[in-house]
């Protein structure tokens, strides 16, 4: 139903959905703190620009009686219930910040007349791609997929002289929300990744994964998985691994690899870690006691959502344009704004762009070292270490299929 927006006459409200079912198990208090920090900065920026307006946030909580799984499984209905609550109260802000679960965002987008922008910290799945009024501030699955295809095809680097066209994907169903959708995208038969690969098999059991490590008849030397080093160790332990196996560990929201005192455990030597560049704000392990790096990224996405709204509000007010219009709703894309930790770039579809970093373990120093970076905005790989001290033969990544000659 048509809901009036509290979004005019110098008073601009942000509706923040505080959902019990969330992409990350983050206390709602921490998200409130992040939103309030963002509001303080936005108010200051607007004042500095000579815009004497009021910006506030309304936190919309669900009752939590029915939708209490805590993860994203029952988020679809929770999101719609919260929208119903907004509708009944006849109170909607200029922008909706909140749904982080792919299920809830997809359903809310489908079931509402979206004449207002929706900003999400999450919504990683492919089903949330290409939504005209949805902005995603954490790297969605599509960005990961494009990196992997780009990297697979690369064959002109000193350390990677073979194109790859095969892969195993380990996916056992216990993944975190981000990993679930990242792996889901790789598994999907209609996805870009599947389309570009000649062979891809999903390993669903621990034993399947463990057997592949030494199986002479394996169809690929490359295994993609998602999680942290501990997750890999639980699965792999100290088992022997064939010398031409390459494990790609997707661990985007974890900047602990970049800390000075971190030593890579021995079981990581066959592993390339894909993570995000820590950017401006690199936390010491002792620094953020209440927030793991992943959770800081989640709360930071809420904060940046507020700053993004402030950025757009400032532009529209300075141009004398109306906020409650489809033009405003569709404007949250193809731009760069000043985020909390530095500039944030959104692509043509409102998805955050970032620098992904591929790390390897140096056999000399037992430290994680940057092998290459990848700019999601231009879909381009930039080699960093031209002569890496790999565990692999001749300090080169092996072919993806054992016994196959140069490509």
């Amino acid at each position: 139903s048509q809901v009036s927006q509290n979004c005019h006459n110098g008073s601009y409200e942000i509706s923040v959905l505080m959902m019990g079912n969330s992409a990350f198990a983050e206390p709602l208090k921490n998200l409130e703190d992040a939103v309030n920090e963002g509001l303080e900065i936005v108010r200051g920026r607007l004042q500095n620009a000579g815009l004497n307006v009021t910006v506030n946030a309304t936190f919309m909580y669900s009752d939590g009686l029915i939708h209490n799984s805590g993860d994203c499984r029952s988020s679809t209905c929770e999101g719609l219930d919260l929208l119903r609550k907004i509708s009944n109260a006849q109170r909607m802000g200029c922008v909706l910040i909140g749904p982080s679960c792919t299920y809830s965002t997809f359903q809310m987008y489908l079931d509402t007349e979206l004449s207002y922008p929706m900003i999400s910290a999450g919504s990683f799945g492919l089903s949330c791609d290409y939504k005209e009024t949805l902005t995603r501030l954490m790297s969605p699955a599509r960005k990961l997929m494009y990196f992997l295809v780009n990297f697979w095809k690369t064959n002109d680097l000193p350390f990677k002289t073979y194109s790859w066209s095969t892969s195993y994907v380990y996916k056992n169903g216990t993944e975190t929300e981000d990993c679930f959708w990242y792996l889901n995208a790789l598994e999907a038969s209609v996805s870009y990744f599947s389309h570009e690969l000649g062979f891809k098999v999903v390993l669903r059991q621990d034993k399947e994964f463990q057997d592949i490590l030494m199986d002479h008849n394996r169809k690929s030397n490359v295994i993609i998985m998602c999680g942290g080093p501990e997750f890999l160790y639980k699965l792999k332990g100290d088992r022997a691994v064939a010398e031409d196996i390459v494990i790609i560990l997707v661990d985007l929201f974890n900047d602990q690899y970049f800390e000075d005192n971190v030593t890579a455990p021995d079981y990581m030597k066959n592993v390339l870690v894909l993570t995000l560049s820590p950017g401006n704000s690199l936390l010491n392990s002792s620094f953020s006691r209440n927030l793991s790096p992943t959770k800081r990224d989640f709360a930071l996405a809420y904060l940046n959502g507020i700053l993004l709204f402030g950025h757009m509000l400032k532009i529209f007010l300075e141009n004398g344009e109306n906020i409650t219009t489809p033009k405003f709703a569709h404007a949250f894309r193809n731009l760069t704004f000043e985020g909390y930790d530095g500039p944030v770039t959104l692509d043509d579809w409102g998805d955050v762009d970032s620098t992904m970093v591929l790390l390897y373990t140096s056999v000399d120093t037992k430290k994680y070292k940057v092998l290459l970076t990848y700019d999601t905005h231009v879909n381009k790989t930039y080699p960093v270490d031209m002569s890496p001290t790999f565990t692999w033969k001749n300090s080169k990544l092996p072919n993806d299929i054992t016994g196959r000659g140069p490509q």
Epitope: N30, D33, A34, E37, G38, I41, G44, R45, N280, S281, L282, L283, N284, S286, F287, S288, R289, N290, L291, R296, A299, L300, L303, Y340
Partner: nanobody
Amino acid sequence: QVQLVESGGGVVRPGGSLRLSCAASGFTFSRYWMSWVRQAPGKGREWVAKIKYDGSEKYYADSVKGRFTISRDNAKNSLYLQMNSLRADDTAVYYCATDFTRDVWGQGTTVTVSS
């Protein structure tokens, strides 16, 4: 070990001035927004001022605007708060804090404005 150590508090008459300092260690100071937060007796913590990591943006609570100035010296890992035209309602323990996560707090420095 991450540490924030505030200093410079004291007793001052209404209309007087004080300069608070905060020495930071154990993290890369130049990468973080920093804030001053205060807590008056029997009240909750209240944000006073914040400054961006490179000093290019500074924001103030309405109650202190025009009287307080926040600044930083990244070379010295130090944060400052120049407080002028002090009033009785500025009496509080002043803390510096870093990052929006507000995970690390110093012991605070007490400012008492009294005639």
